[in-house]
C-alpha cells in the first residue's frame, strides 16, 4: 500500500477519506487505527457502528469521528481540533472476523496555524530519515454535514 498524506492546520478540522470497492467490502465494518512504530501494531482509534446497516451514523471517540458511505464506498474520518500530537501514520481498515484488511495508509501532517505566532517547534513533520515512497499529498478542507444531509441507510 502506498501512503497518502493528509495535511491539516493545527486547531482546525481535518477530513480523511478512504475509498474502497463497496462490493468487495460489503457487510464489513470499518475502523481507523494509529500505527505504533514502523513495524508495530495498529491501535484502534474508532470503528463504525456495530451494526453495518447503521455505518452511515457518525461515531466519535474523543475528537475523532468515523462515518461510512457503504454504497459509494468511501470511509471518512474527521479529526477535530487537530493537534501536533495527532500527526503520524494511520490506517483505514475493513474488518472481517477479528482480522482487518488495510484500505489505505494515511500520513497525517499538522501544519502551523498561520494566524498563531506561537513557537511551531513542536509541530510534527516527517524527518528525512522517514521515507514514504510514492506518498500522495492531499490538502483536506472539511465541513460538517448539513441538517437532513445524512445519507439514507442501505437496505438489506
Amino acid at each position: 500500500h502506498n501512503t497518502t498524506v493528509f495535511q491539516g492546520v493545527a486547531g482546525q478540522s481535518l477530513q480523511v477519506s478512504c475509498p474502497y470497492d463497496s462490493m468487495k467490502h460489503w457487510g464489513r465494518r470499518k475502523a481507523w487505527c494509529r500505527q505504533l512504530g514502523e513495524k508495530g501494531p495498529c491501535q484502534r482509534v474508532v470503528s463504525t457502528h456495530n451494526l453495518w446497516l447503521l455505518s452511515f451514523l457518525r461515531r466519535w471517540n474523543g475528537s475523532t469521528a468515523i462515518t461510512d458511505d457503504t454504497l459509494g464506498g468511501t470511509l471518512t474520518i474527521t479529526l477535530r481540533n487537530l493537534q501536533p500530537h495527532d500527526a503520524g501514520l494511520y490506517q483505514c481498515q475493513s474488518l472481517h472476523g477479528s482480522e482487518a484488511d488495510t484500505l489505505r495508509k494515511v500520513l497525517v501532517e499538522v501544519l502551523a496555524d498561520p494566524l498563531d505566532h506561537r513557537d511551531a517547534g513542536d509541530l510534527w513533520f516527517p524527518g528525512e530519515s522517514e521515507s514514504f515512497e510514492d506518498a500522495h499529498v492531499e490538502h483536506s478542507i472539511s465541513r460538517s454535514l448539513l441538517e437532513g444531509e445524512i445519507p439514507f441507510p442501505p437496505t438489506s
Epitope: 462490493m23 468487495k24 460489503w26 457487510g27 451494526l51 446497516l53 472481517h96 472476523g97 477479528s98 438489506s156
Partner: antibody
Framework: EVQLVQSGAEVKKPGESLKISCKGS????????IAWVRQMPGKGLEWMGI????????RYSPSFQGQVTISADKSISTAYLQWSSLKASDTAMYFC????????????????WGQGTLVTVSS | DIQMTQSPSSVSASVGDRVTITCRAS??????LAWYQQKPGKAPKLLIY???SLQRGVPSRFSGSGSGTDFTLTISSLQPEDFATYFC?????????FGQGTKLEIK
C-alpha cells in the same frame, strides 16, 4: 438461481499439471469471494484459499501456499485452481464455494458450493 | 492456525431424538462460527452462521449456540434426512479451519 458448476473428474499422473474450474451463475460473480476447499478420501474439509474475482485479490492457507495457484476470470465468471506438478497426495475432492459476508457480524461464510471435482493422481 | 475440535466424532440416534454436537475452538472466536451438513458424495450445505443464525431454507429444528470457544449444534427432533456428517468452521481468522466432522448415524 445461484449456481457454481465445476469441471469434471480428472485422472492424472504424478508430475503432470492440472487446472480445474468453477463457473458461477445467477449472481454477480465479480462481487463475491470464491474459496477452494479440499476433502481427501474419507476425511474432513480443508480451506485452501480464497479469491475476489473483481480484482483477483487472493489469500492462501499457509498449508497450500506455493503448492497451488488460485485465479479467476471475471469476464467469464470462472474461478480456477491449478497445480504445476501433481503428487499422489493431491488425490481428493475439490470444492469451490461462494463466500458471503453477513452484515450481522461482518464475517463471511460459504453459502453456495459447487458439486466438487474429483482429482485422482496415480502412476 | 485455529484448531476446531468436534465431539463426538460419531453418534447413533433414532428419528425423533434430540441430538447435540459440540465444537471447541483452540482460541476465542467470538461468534464467528458456522455449521455445515454434508451427505455422502455431495457438497456441504450451510446450516448456521454467526453461531446461531439459521440460514434461509434450513428447518427450524436446527439451532446453534455458543460464543468464545464453545459452541453447540442442536437438532431438536431428528428426521430421516438429517443423517449425515456435520462440520463446524471458524470465520474469525485466516486460514479458515473446520472441525474434523461428526457422523450422525441411524441407531
Amino acid at each position: 438461481e445461484v449456481q457454481l458448476v465445476q469441471s469434471g473428474a480428472e485422472v492424472k499422473k504424478p508430475g503432470e499439471s492440472l487446472k480445474i474450474s468453477c463457473k458461477g451463475s445467477g449472481y454477480s460473480f465479480r462481487s463475491y469471494w470464491i474459496a477452494w476447499v479440499r476433502q481427501m478420501p474419507g476425511k474432513g474439509l480443508e480451506w485452501m484459499g480464497i479469491i475476489y474475482p473483481g480484482d483477483s485479490d487472493t489469500r492462501y492457507s499457509p498449508s497450500f501456499q506455493g503448492q497451488v495457484t488460485i485465479s479467476a476470470d471475471k469476464s467469464i465468471s470462472t474461478a480456477y485452481l491449478q497445480w504445476s506438478s501433481l503428487k499422489a497426495s493431491d488425490t481428493a475432492m475439490y470444492f469451490c464455494a461462494r463466500s458471503r459476508t453477513f452484515y450481522y457480524d461482518s464475517s463471511d461464510y460459504f453459502d453456495y458450493w459447487g458439486q466438487g471435482t474429483l482429482v485422482t493422481v496415480s502412476s | 492456525d485455529i484448531q476446531m475440535t468436534q465431539s463426538p466424532s460419531s453418534v447413533s440416534a433414532s428419528v425423533g431424538d434430540r441430538v447435540t454436537i459440540t465444537c471447541r475452538a483452540s482460541q476465542g472466536i467470538s461468534s464467528w462460527l458456522a455449521w455445515y451438513q454434508q451427505k455422502p458424495g455431495k457438497a456441504p450445505k450451510l446450516l448456521i452462521y454467526a453461531a446461531s443464525s439459521l440460514q434461509r431454507g434450513v428447518p427450524s429444528r436446527f439451532s446453534g449456540s455458543g460464543s468464545g470457544t464453545d459452541f453447540t449444534l442442536t437438532i431438536s427432533s431428528l428426521q430421516p434426512e438429517d443423517f449425515a456428517t456435520y462440520f463446524c468452521q471458524q470465520a474469525d481468522r485466516f486460514p479458515r479451519t473446520f472441525g474434523q466432522g461428526t457422523k450422525l448415524e441411524i441407531k
